[in-house]
């Protein structure tokens, strides 16, 4: 266990041209406050994913009113450190988000208004117990200067706060095999109480006989690297050689979420969905009001009307959750019609439409035939985002530009001879057959299977196909 500490040194305009306008004015005095969110590991995580290592809010800074005509100076800051307690081992690598918020103190209906001024994020390696690390981050035209460190809470020591220390029993030296606890030379490393064989690098314990694994390691002694591949069951097969998570108690067993929070398993651990008025990794932080700035991602906080609705976050488009902490997968609603591709750009949705369709949601079927002429008297037929020409007799091809040979397909049956004609084709039938395509046999008694031939045409004459 330990505490991550963040000290904000300054927040103001960054170097270079385009200095930002002061966020406060004589008409709208304001003050700043900060929020820090910590996540274990170096993975690039979205801003709205849970602050699994913890989060903290600063106090409000002094009220600031801009001097007319003066450039935006470094703005007055809240007193004190931001402290994020962590219960388990310090992971050594972590991601952070630091948000600078403005509280407007003008005469708003409904109380003060909050707005996000700047957000910076980074990924760092940091050993617990080390000196303060200094950092400068820029967000647009703003610059944030800060320092941070992680320190262990006694009796924990070490770079991960996993070793335990106890006051010396003898004044001169530590017991056999036990080292002094630097930098606390008057204390000694406590006897090893973890399960025998528990990896000293990848495991730790808080109770005698247990072996809890740092992120990325598994197995009863935390000696097996976690691999997400080749796992067959929801928590992986039981063979420790596969490097999969071993079946056993799930992270939600016993519900680690306090205050009525509901637990859901995640690939790495668990996540608590907290009822209103509670937040934190295990919903352990309570008594939240709008003054604590609980709405993330630019959500607007309003005071609730009863103790179970202590505050309400009205989320901007694209976010949801009681603290606006979840990004809405708006494409899952399949808003793009006619096979359009959905793109969630954060601030807006875009649909990339298939050929032949247009509109914000690809809802308009374009006139496929617009500007598409079919040559030689052909007519255009629309369909499915493409156009097709129905050609006049004697023409073919996509645009009816090719002169067709009507005899190419051998249309005259029973050995009839085909002649191309300006209006189509004519079949000259072999003896014993008649019809436009010579398809009907002439009966031996002279009667045909068709009605009597029209006047002037004897059976056996060439029949013109009209």
């Amino acid at each position: 266990a330990g505490v991550f500490e963040l000290q904000i040194h300054s927040f103001g305009p960054g170097p270079g041209p385009g200095a930002p306008r002061s966020p406060c004015s004589a008409r709208l005095p304001c003050r700043l406050f900060f929020r820090v969110c910590l996540k274990p590991g170096l993975s690039e995580e979205a801003a709205e994913s849970p602050c699994a290592l913890g989060a903290a809010l600063s106090a409000r800074g002094p009220v600031y009113t801009e001097q007319p005509g003066a450039p935006a100076p470094d703005l007055p800051l809240p007193d004190g450190l931001l402290q994020v307690p962590f219960r388990d081992a310090w992971p050594g690598t972590f991601s952070f988000i630091i948000e600078t918020w403005r509280e407007e103190l003008g005469d708003q209906i409904g109380g003060p208004a909050w707005s996000l001024l700047a957000r910076v994020a980074g990924r760092r390696r940091l050993a617990a117990g080390g000196p303060w690390a200094r950092d400068i981050q820029r967000a647009g035209a703003w610059e944030l200067r800060f320092s941070y460190r992680a320190r262990c809470e006694p009796p924990a020591v070490g770079t991960a706060c996993t070793r335990l220390c106890r006051p010396r029993s003898a004044p001169s030296r530590c017991g056999p095999g036990l080292r002094p606890c630097a930098p606390l030379e008057d204390e000694c490393e406590a006897p090893l109480v973890c399960r025998a064989g528990c990896s000293p690098e990848h495991g730790f314990c808080e109770q005698p006989g247990e072996c809890r694994c740092l992120e990325g390691w598994t197995g009863p002694l935390c000696t097996v690297p976690v691999s997400t591949s080749s796992c067959l069951s929801p928590r992986g097969p039981s063979s420790a050689t596969t490097g999969c998570l071993v079946p056993g108690p799930g992270p939600c067993d016993g519900n680690p979420c306090a205050n009525g929070g509901s637990c859901s398993e995640t690939p790495r651990s668990f996540e608590c969905t907290c009822p209103r008025g509670f937040y934190g990794l295990r919903c352990e932080v309570s008594g939240v009001t709008c003054a604590d700035g609980p709405c993330f991602n630019g959500g607007l906080c309003v005071g609730g009307a009863d103790p179970d609705s202590a505050y309400i976050c009205h989320c901007p488009p694209g976010f949801q959750g009681s603290n606006c902490e979840k990004r809405v997968d708006r494409c899952s609603l399949q808003p793009c019609r006619n096979g359009g591709l959905c793109l969630d750009l954060g601030h807006a949705l875009r649909c990339r439409c298939r050929a032949g369709f247009a509109g914000p949601r690809c809802e308009h079927d374009l006139d496929d035939c617009a500007g598409r002429a079919c040559a030689n008297g052909g007519t255009c037929v629309e369909g499915g985002g493409a156009h097709r020409c129905s050609c006049a007799l004697g023409f073919g091809g996509r645009d009816c530009r090719e002169r067709a040979d009507p005899c190419a397909a051998r249309p005259c049956a029973h050995g009839g001879r085909c002649y191309a004609h300006f209006s189509g084709l004519v079949c000259a039938c072999a003896p014993g057959y008649m019809g436009a395509r010579c398809e009907f046999p002439v009966h031996p008694d002279g009667a045909s299977a068709l009605p009597a031939a029209p006047p002037g045409l004897r059976p056996g004459d060439p029949q013109r196909y009209l």
Epitope: I109, G110, G111, N259, G260, G261, S262, P275, T289, A291, V302, G303, G304, A305, D306, P307, D308, S309, A310, Y311, I312
Partner: antibody
Framework: EVQLVETGGGLVQPKGSLKLSCAVS????????MNWVRQAPGKGLEWVAR??????????YYADSVKDRFTISRDDSQSMLYLQMNNLKIEDTAMYYC????????WGQGTLVTVSA | QAVVTQESALTTSPGETVTLTCRSS?????????ANWIQEKPDHLFTGLIG???NRAPGVPARFSGSLIGDKAALTITGAQTEDEAIYFC?????????FGGGTKLTVL
């Protein structure tokens, strides 16, 4: 728009029983605490009972005047709120409202309960 | 049990500003009392006006505002209209119990 529709009121004799229902629509009923409030003829408002959500173990709270006689309950699957009223007294005569507090107060149209000999 | 006290009646004129207050017998009204203001018009027509001290309900005119003034919750009507004539109740939460004031009958002459 949030809608709260109370039913089940009527005329009942002292020491009798009645069960009020409130059908809720247009919001996520399961998330919120729900309340019953009443107004006796010519009088002010009196809070009667409250039931919290599943996350808070459906905890219930009652005004002293109705404790041990009234029972508030809910059916999340049907978005229904109930008030079982036993051992009714003449002073329980009132218009009963299903009330939901969120960013402000949402009221139903009420159902009249008359306790008379 | 806490007692919540309101002015029994107030009279104002159209266009005037009037403030209704809500006092708690247990001491100062704070944000954890989640003061609510409710308007009652004839025929048991109740409308939630303000929640959480200062959160105005949608559709409620901007002339209605809620606040904490000193040790009391307050409802201010800036530029009262004749249609604002009604009974106004304030409700305060004490943990999970709600206590209403007796109501203020507002007359707009």
């Amino acid at each position: 728009e949030v809608q709260l529709v109370e039913t089940g009121g009527g005329l009942v004799q002292p020491k009798g029983s009645l069960k009020l229902s409130c059908a809720v629509s247009a919001f996520t009923f399961t998330t919120y605490a729900m309340n019953w409030v009443r107004q006796a003829p010519g009088k002010g408002l009196e809070w009667v009972a409250r039931i919290r959500n599943k996350s808070n173990n459906y905890a219930t709270y009652y005004a002293d005047s109705v404790k041990d006689r009234f029972t508030i309950s809910r059916d999340d699957s049907q978005s229904m709120l109930y008030l079982q009223m036993n051992n009714l007294k003449i002073e329980d005569t009132a218009m009963y409202y299903c009330v939901f507090y969120y960013d402000y107060v949402y009221w139903g149209q009420g159902t009249l309960v008359t306790v008379s000999a | 049990q806490a007692v919540v006290t309101q002015e029994s009646a107030l009279t104002t004129s159209p266009g005037e500003t009037v403030t209704l207050t809500c006092r708690s017998s247990t001491g100062a009204v704070t944000t954890s009392n989640y003061a609510n203001w409710i308007q009652e018009k004839p025929d048991h027509l109740f409308t939630g006006l303000i929640g959480g001290h200062n959160n105005r309900a949608p559709g409620v005119p901007a002339r209605f505002s809620g606040s904490l003034i000193g040790d009391k919750a307050a409802l201010t009507i800036t530029g009262a209209q004749t249609e604002d004539e009604a009974i106004y109740f304030c409700g305060l939460w004490y943990s999970n119990h709600l206590v209403f004031g007796g109501g203020t009958k507002l007359t707009v002459l």
